[in-house]
């Protein structure tokens, strides 16, 4: 007989994530050749042992401590993205831009972009019939912990000018909900990041409004600048040129505003 | 092959401070956090921190925030310790170690500290 | 801090027994245990790292089983170069801790 089982209401973990995290880790280890130390086999062991056989509402970031200890990577300096509730052009950036680095490029969240996870209390199994949700069940769940503690780590060692991108499509360009606004703005360390850049990336093509004034924007600069790190905020009307110049720099139409 | 060498045996006054040297040689120095081990007779060993000398990342057993400071230098390849306002408590042997699969792979010979007046 | 309580604290064999020596962590570690030997007046050696791997150059007569809370370290046809001091130490959680160690001797 099936054995009862936790009904949870976000989704269940996703199908193949043993093979899918190992996978990914040995072809980022493959492709970045200053990761190739790295045991994929340990950094499995050590995901999995943050939440096999753990209530999956009681995860703590602790739980990820040898995880997180393994796949230490560094970025170097002014060349860290941020970014919030735009993912898709963050990594679009990144793949053209490649001495610029987002938490997808770096191995832990490459591992996990994407995925979902979790087990059950006392069981070694992994469930893929449900997981808990954020909002409706609880925040302390394998991956929710894993974001916030990985995106913690990524803001405590990046230093330089520090880069995020926000989506100016939304109602709060900032949101101080978000894990940009509740972990990454908040673990930045003054002594060693000198500036955070923001860019603002306009939805409308006929939008010209300085979206660097709204309140939220202002409100991150508060913040920011009561951490004695300077704020600097740059409009980005065309997000297509803007990737566009990225590319070919060179190119006339790429010497006016983007 | 793997070597850590540390440099070799203080004796200094109690309040002073010592700075003790671990230099690696035969692998990506960069790629492996540095451990760092207390031990003195009778007391066993005591994980002090260690250090990512990649990009300086530090973690210290809350024990001995304060006492100890941990740096390297990448272009030397060398770890660094500083112990301050040393007591008869810090009397010990210091050994470094690389980072491997949560444990320490490779030691160096220590470095012996005595602290008197 | 997680408590590494190692038994027995001596233990005394004689050459070619088998012995066991056992760490229990005082919560779950996985599998991130490391076994050291450290002979008289010498540095501490890696003998075992996550729980059950052998480090290069070990002899097999070395080996290492557990996870979660209970380990062992087991020790076949003991060798007159195996009288040292044995440590375990976890690595699951800061700050790491070794446990109080075994202090092997041959009768």
């Known amino acids: 007989l099936p054995r009862w089982r936790q009904q949870w209401s976000g989704s269940g973990t996703t199908s193949r994530f043993p093979e899918t995290v190992l996978a990914r880790c040995v072809k980022y280890t493959e492709v970045h050749p200053e990761m190739r130390h790295v045991d994929c086999q340990s950094v499995w062991d050590a995901f999995k042992g943050a939440f096999i056989s753990k209530y999956p509402c009681n995860i703590t970031e602790e739980d990820y401590q040898p995880l997180v200890k393994l796949g230490t990577q560094t970025v170097p300096c002014n060349k860290t993205l941020l970014w919030s509730r735009i993912k898709d052009l963050a990594h679009q950036f990144t793949q053209v831009q490649r001495d610029m680095f987002t938490l997808e490029d770096m191995l832990l969240g490459y591992l996990a972009d994407d995925l979902t996870w979790c087990g059950e209390f006392n069981t070694f199994e992994i469930n893929y019939q449900s997981c808990p949700d954020w909002r409706k069940d609880c925040s302390n769940n394998p991956v929710s912990v894993f974001w916030k503690t990985v995106s913690r780590r990524f803001a405590e060692t990046a230093c330089g000018v520090v880069h995020v991108m926000l989506n100016g499509s939304r109602s709060k360009i900032f949101d101080k909900n978000s894990t940009f606004g509740s972990v990454e703005v908040h673990n930045l360390q003054p002594e060693k990041v000198q500036a955070l850049e923001a860019w603002v990336i306009h939805g409308g093509r006929e939008d010209s409004r300085d979206l660097c004034q709204d309140p939220t924007i202002k409100e991150l600069e508060s913040i920011i600048s009561k951490r004695n790190i300077r704020f600097f905020c740059k409009n980005i009307y065309r997000p297509d040129k803007f990737l566009q110049c990225v590319k070919n720099p060179e190119d006339s139409s790429c010497l006016s505003g983007i | 092959q793997v070597q850590l060498q540390q440099s070799g045996a203080e004796l200094v006054r109690p309040g002073t401070s010592v700075k003790m040297s671990c230099k690696a040689a035969?692998?990506?120095?960069?790629?492996?956090?540095i451990e760092w081990v207390k031990q003195r007779p009778g007391h066993g060993l005591e994980w002090i921190g260690d250090i990512f000398p990649g990009g300086g990342y530090t973690d210290y057993n809350e024990k001995f925030k304060g006492k100890a400071t941990l740096t390297a230098d990448t272009s030397s390849s060398t770890a660094y310790m500083q112990l301050s306002s040393l007591t008869s408590e810090d009397s010990a042997i210091y050994y470094c170690?690389?980072?491997?699969?949560?444990?320490?792979?490779?030691w160096g010979q220590g470095t012996s500290v005595t602290v008197s007046s | 801090d997680i408590q590494m309580n190692q038994s027995p604290s001596s233990l005394s064999a004689s050459l070619g027994d088998t012995i066991t020596i056992t760490c229990h962590a005082s919560?779950?570690?996985?599998?991130?245990l490391g076994w050291y030997q450290q002979k008289p007046g010498n540095i501490p050696k890696l003998l075992i790292y996550k729980a059950s791997n052998l480090h290069t150059g070990v002899p097999s007569r070395f080996s290492g089983s557990g996870s979660g809370t209970g380990f062992t370290l087991t020790i076949s046809s003991l060798q007159p170069e195996d009288i040292a001091t044995y440590y375990c130490?976890?690595?699951?959680?800061?700050?790491?801790?070794f446990g109080g160690g075994t202090k092997l001797e041959i009768k």
């Open positions: 170690a690389r980072g491997r699969d949560l444990a320490m792979d490779y």
């Open positions: 919560q779950n570690i996985n599998v991130w």
């Open positions: 035969g692998y990506t120095f960069t790629n492996h956090w």
């Open positions: 130490q976890q690595g699951q959680s800061y700050p790491y801790t």
